[in-house]
Interface confidence: low
């Protein structure tokens, strides 16, 4: 016996968030892994008085304590619909079925005399049917439904007389069913029987407040189990050759402070006082845990030395329950001021360390959904995925000997103190129906797939490819708005006067009259901030730099009456100095952010993008920029993520769609102007960049979620892409969806109607497709009332906690970008595509491993799109150059310009042009390739200001 559970809270220093196997493991379970599902008799059988069954303490408790619950008589009626249960088991394809025998169905008053024939026949028929189907039965003798007569006559488990009566009942079951049953569970979760039955009064028999009674009940449950184990071991195991255990349930808990000894001590105490209370006598040294003995000496019964010897080792495996009943209500649990957690993997590790690595059967695991959820139990899939992933990690990475898993539960049924307000079944049952059909929920389909594949197969992504991007591929980095320096920070050589220093007198400088020195013209390097930009860009080794102008700085009045020439000079310097390093600019004219619209004040006060005249003001601004910078800039983005301005213009859907309309017109006007006036001489290309996250159905078994995923893309991307790239009008699917909601009175939104002239204006006003892609969203359909863009979509998002995610909860899902690129090509034809922003926030200030992982994986998928799918991908711009103070850390450089290690990683990908084969030598010609100029770099770094 080792008892070293507390070591689990000393965190593994080798944990790295980008080793995805430590978050989610794509692997299979051991070859003969035992897949099962469970029910409790009282929860599903119904027929509480039928065919001679006696009342249980729960039948009585329901009638006396639970409001609004008539009885368990309805439930799923498994007693009547046995065949339907068997069909459900067949559907899922389990290896075992764990069910419990209702003690009062066999012996109505609890005492073992002549068994109730109908009850005996029911269980016998069930066992025969399971054996016939090759489904192993795991039979629980006591799942909380004590015959009421024993409670009334003896006081239930408070009285040690029950121990022998329970042993008689067990003996009868071994005799009648043992030929067909190889796995026995004596008692299901004795902690809850004692704690909630006699402590909080939340469970039958509903007694509360007497701590001595709680621990007496626990004591008798342990002794009852031990007696039955010895009975089976001596009289039945030799010929029946089965195994017997007791199911012990627990929560899991994490310390508030992972390095704090006191907090870790409290966590150990918390686990010991729930799981250890029963596990220590049975799986440990035969006695209660030392901490409990000290703390509860006045109420905790004592085991004699002989009893300790008798208790110890009375389980053939460790049967473990981990589900909501041990977590709620939490304030009745030994929380000890620490943080309750659903980390099953850590709980299993604790069992391994505390009880010397036993073989473990997970005898109950799952969560719950609201009673109104029918067959689309999406969150249940993710809970199951998370739990199963943790079990798999425990087996594969921690070498824990888990040999089986019981999903809970087969059917919706009576959920103890929650009665019928929650559901835990993988099959939906309408309790008010006559036929009680078992309808498979999404979780049933999911579990079936897990069993069929014996784990998680990596179907989402294809293997990495080796290959390179084309020589003219733009390797970029994106920055948001560059605020121009209003005055050059370095004005030396601009003052023509000579001064002498009065060193001995007043220590001031005095101008020497009549002397004029030669000045030098202003230089780009007078701007300190440009020097910083160039240093960073040079280290990035990129070929392209995408940054945004500040409209409000260039045109403070919003029109051409007051042009800030200094700002334009600053931007021209950024571009020209970059070109000296071989770095071309992609310039964004307008880059609004959630916090700041970035409009000139007068336009902001005139209703911003709700005012159509803003579009004309934008055209004038764009014309000025094309004129002043267009000889140097060949790639233009008019507006960054106009499809995200819905976050700001969100008072109503009509505001959102009105603003979007004006943004589209603004872009089109600017593009037409460039096309007409500047393209002939400047030969550049103009587009707008759309926020383009991919969407997947949160629940792949629900048609409504597939439709929601496509609808997300229509509302998010097609909303702007369709009018510009294709038809000149909004997507028909989006228009029809909003109109349909309007007709049903669910929304008063409407997409603007476009005139023929507007359609002609918009259509075809892009020279390339620019997409900002960061993540993939998991979406589900949920009908939402209201007249806002967000509710018009009828979409909710789900966070998959098994996915690698950033601090701002951006999920790392590389294959989403490839799907996006294919979707764009399928919908909008074969055109040049630039990914104009793509990146992740990473807390690390130096070794930003998450960002390196993200870049490598996402660029792999972009390369697949290029090599395999033949998508015309022209460039990838990593987001972003430098982080901003107190914002999520997206930068390659910190806010005080310190370089992170992802820069070297990106350098390597750029210099290799992707992921070439070993010894690949397909270098580009000197003119095409952006060679790093060491002298240039030296000059940039050393040039005096």
């Amino acid at each position: 016996f080792s008892g070293d559970g507390r070591a689990i809270w000393s965190k593994n220093p080798n944990f790295t968030p980008v080793n995805e196997s430590q978050l989610f493991l794509y692997d299979t379970f051991p070859k003969n892994f035992f897949w099962g599902i469970g029910t409790g008799a009282l929860q599903v059988e119904g027929s509480w008085k039928k065919d001679g069954k006696g009342p249980s303490i729960w039948d009585h408790f329901i009638h006396t304590h639970l409001k609004n619950v008539s009885s368990t008589n309805g439930s799923s009626d498994s007693y009547i619909f046995l065949e339907k249960d068997l069909s459900a088991l067949d559907f899922i394809g389990v290896s075992f079925y764990q069910f419990s025998i209702s003690w009062p169905r066999l012996f109505p008053d609890g005492i073992v005399t002549v068994a109730n024939a109908k009850g005996l026949q029911y269980y016998s028929t069930l066992l025969d049917a399971l054996v016939l189907r090759n489904i192993e039965p795991i039979v629980t003798l006591y799942h909380w439904d004590l015959p009421l007569a024993l409670q009334e006559k003896y006081g239930g488990w408070k009285n040690d007389t029950i121990i022998d009566i329970f042993n008689d009942y067990a003996t009868y079951c071994f005799q009648m069913f043992g030929d067909r049953v190889k796995y026995w569970i004596t008692i299901h979760n004795p902690y809850l029987v004692a704690w909630h039955g006699y402590g909080t009064g939340m469970h039958a028999p509903g007694e509360k407040g007497n701590l001595a009674a709680v621990y007496t009940v626990g004591h008798n449950l342990i002794k009852a189990h031990s007696k039955v184990w010895h009975n089976y071991n001596t009289h039945f195991r030799p010929h029946q050759k089965g195994w017997l255990s007791i199911t012990l349930g627990s929560h899991w808990i994490e310390p508030n402070r992972s390095e704090n000894t006191m907090d870790i001590f409290k966590c150990q105490q918390s686990m010991v006082s729930v799981l250890g209370w029963f596990a220590n006598p049975i799986h440990g040294d035969g006695d209660y845990p030392e901490g409990m003995r000290k703390k509860l000496f006045s109420v905790l019964p004592i085991f004699s030395e002989a009893e300790k010897h008798e208790m110890r080792g009375t389980a053939d495996f460790f049967a473990f329950s981990f589900g909501p009943n041990n977590f709620k209500p939490l304030n009745t649990m030994a929380k000890m001021g620490q943080n309750v957690s659903l980390n099953l993997r850590e709980a299993l590790n604790w069992i391994k360390l505390e009880y010397n690595n036993p073989r473990i059967l997970i005898a109950e695991n799952g969560w719950f959904t609201d009673s109104r959820v029918k067959t689309e139990d999406t969150t249940a899939i993710y809970m199951m995925k998370n739990f199963l992933s943790q079990v798999l990690q425990a087996i594969r990475l921690d070498e824990i000997r888990v040999f089986g898993y019981t999903a809970w539960s087969l059917l919706d049924g009576f959920e103890w103190q929650d009665a019928y307000t929650i559901r835990r079944g993988l099959f939906y049952v309408d309790f008010n129906s006559k036929q009680k059909e078992r309808k498979p929920k999404s979780s049933a389909h999911y579990y079936k797939q897990i069993i069929r594949e014996n784990g998680f197969s990596l179907k989402e992504s294809t293997p990495d490819v080796q290959g390179q991007f084309p020589c003219d591929f733009s390797w970029g980095v994106t920055e948001s708005v560059l605020k121009p320096e209003s005055v050059a920070s370095s004005p030396q050589f601009s003052d023509p006067h000579l001064y002498v220093w009065n060193a001995t007198g007043n220590r001031l400088l005095h101008r020497v009259e009549g002397v004029r020195l030669k000045t030098r013209p202003a230089q780009c390097t007078d701007f300190v901030n440009i020097k910083k930009q160039l240093e960073m860009l040079a280290r990035m080794k990129v070929t392209h730099y995408r940054f945004a102008l500040d409209w409000a700085s260039v045109l403070p009045t919003g029109n051409l009456s007051a042009v800030n020439r200094q700002a334009l000079r600053y931007y021209r310097c950024v571009v020209s100095e970059g070109l000296k390093l071989g770095i071309s600019a992609m310039v964004t004219l307008y880059y609004p952010t959630h916090a700041h619209l970035g409009l000139p004040e007068p336009l902001l006060h005139a209703d911003g993008w709700l005012n159509p005249s803003t579009a004309e003001a934008f055209q004038a601004y764009a014309g000025l920029c094309f004129q002043e910078l267009g000889d140097l800039v060949k790639l233009w983005i008019t507006i960054n993520e106009p499809n995200r301005l819905s976050d700001i213009y969100n008072r109503s859907g009509n505001d959102t769609y009105g603003a979007a309309h004006n943004l589209l017109v603004a872009h089109a006007l600017a593009w037409r102007l460039y096309d007409r006036q500047f393209r002939p001489s400047q030969r550049g290309a103009v587009s707008l960049s759309l926020h383009a996250d991919w969407a997947e159905p949160a629940n792949p078994y629900a048609d409504s979620h597939w439709r929601a995923a496509e609808r997300f893309l229509q509302f998010e991307i097609a909303w702007f892409a369709e009018p510009l790239f294709k038809t000149g009008d909004y997507p028909a699917a989006m228009r029809e969806y909003i109109a349909s909601k309007h007709r049903r009175g669910l929304s008063s939104s409407a997409l603007p109607r476009l005139t023929e002239a507007e359609r002609r204006l918009l259509k075809g006003t892009v020279d390339f497709c620019a997409l900002n892609h960061f993540t993939t969203r998991f979406v589900m359909h949920e009908q939402l009332a209201g007249s806002r863009y967000d509710s018009d979509r009828d979409i909710q998002f789900l966070q998959d906690i098994t996915r690698l995610s950033s601090p701002t909860r951006l999920a790392v899902i590389p294959w989403g970008v490839r799907k996006l690129l294919r979707w764009v090509r399928r919908n909008y034809g074969d055109m040049d595509i630039y990914i104009t922003a793509s990146g992740i926030d990473d807390q690390a200030l130096e070794d930003d491993r998450l960002r390196k992982y993200y870049l490598g994986k996402y660029l792999q998928e972009v390369l697949k799109a290029y090599l395999i799918d033949k998508v015309r991908i022209k460039g990838y711009y990593a987001f972003k150059l430098a982080e901003e103070k107190s914002k999520p850390r997206f930068g390659f450089f910190t806010s005080d310009f310190k370089a992170k290690s992802s820069i070297q990683f990106y350098n390597k990908v750029i210099s290799s042009r992707g992921f070439p084969f070993e010894n690949s030598s397909s270098r580009c010609s000197q003119t095409q390739e952006n060679t790093e100029c060491t002298v240039c770099l030296f000059l940039v770094q050393k040039k005096p200001l």
């Epitope: 929380k335 001021g337 949920e782």
Partner: antibody, heavy 124, light 109 residues
Framework: QVTLKESGPVLVKPTETLTLTCTVS??????????VSWIRQPPGKALEWLAH???????SYSTSLKSRLTISKDTSKSQVVLTMTNMDPVDTATYYC????????????????WGQGTTVTVSS | SYVLTQPPSVSVAPGQTARITCGGS??????VHWYQQKPGQAPVLVVY???DRPSGIPERFSGSNSGNTATLTISRVEAGDEADYYC???????????FGGGTKLTVLG
């Protein structure tokens, strides 16, 4: 963003019934992890919890006011309604509705978003 | 039913640390939430589940809970922290929300 807004009469006569409506936006009352409480605060006094409605439509009421309170919700309208019968001048207070979110089981993480409150005066 | 006891007032000089207590029978096994309420405004959640901070709440606000006392600690107190503070728990046995009587924090000077 998530908002809650209370509405109802400013003035109520003694013995009348008060009906208050909390209209929510930015989240769904269908959400299995969300509940809404009503709380009141008489002038210059402490907060007093009145009632709560859980995601599964279960209700819970303050023991001292249970006989006078009814809480309900209309998910389609995104509204939670509280009625309080037999009003008395001592019921003069600012009435707030607030959202609670569940993180595990039936365990709430505090009331993370509150309405701005509506002041009700009971006077003849 | 469950009762939470708070001191009616606490005074502290700017820059110092304020500690507001909330007493309750074995409160350490409950989850305690803390709210700040400024005059004429709705309460704002500043600490939940004993010690967690919602986004947007400064790190100066922290909480702890053990035994029979939960504590809200405000370090480097500023004039803008002057407000009423309430503790709250869910009484799981009755499914009732329980608030403390509130503590008025006064920032001196």
């Amino acid at each position: 963003q998530v908002t809650l807004k209370e509405s109802g009469p400013v003035l109520v006569k003694p013995t009348e019934t008060l009906t208050l409506t909390c209209t929510v936006s930015g989240f769904s009352l269908n959400n299995a992890r969300v509940g809404v409480s009503w709380i009141r605060q008489p002038p210059g006094k402490a907060l007093e919890w009145l009632a709560h409605i859980f995601s599964n439509d279960e209700k819970s009421y303050s023991t001292s006011l249970k006989s006078r309170l009814t809480i309900s919700k209309d998910t389609s309208k995104s509204q939670v309604v509280l009625t309080m019968t037999n009003m008395d001048p001592v019921d003069t207070a600012t009435y707030y509705c607030a959202r609670s979110v569940v993180t595990g089981g039936y365990y709430y993480d505090g009331m993370d978003v509150w309405g701005q409150g509506t002041t009700v005066t009971v006077s003849s | 039913s469950y009762v939470l006891t708070q001191p009616p007032s606490v005074s502290v000089a700017p820059g110092q640390t304020a500690r507001i207590t909330c007493g309750g029978s074995n409160i350490g096994s409950e989850s305690v939430h803390w709210y700040q309420q400024k005059p004429g405004q709705a309460p704002v959640l500043v600490v939940y589940d004993d010690s967690d901070r919602p986004s947007g709440i400064p790190e100066r606000f922290s909480g702890s809970n053990s035994g029979n006392t939960a504590t809200l600690t405000i370090s480097r107190v500023e004039a803008g922290d002057e407000a009423d503070y309430y503790c709250q728990v869910w009484d799981g046995n009755s499914d009732h929300v329980v608030f403390g009587g509130g503590t008025k924090l006064t920032v001196l000077g």
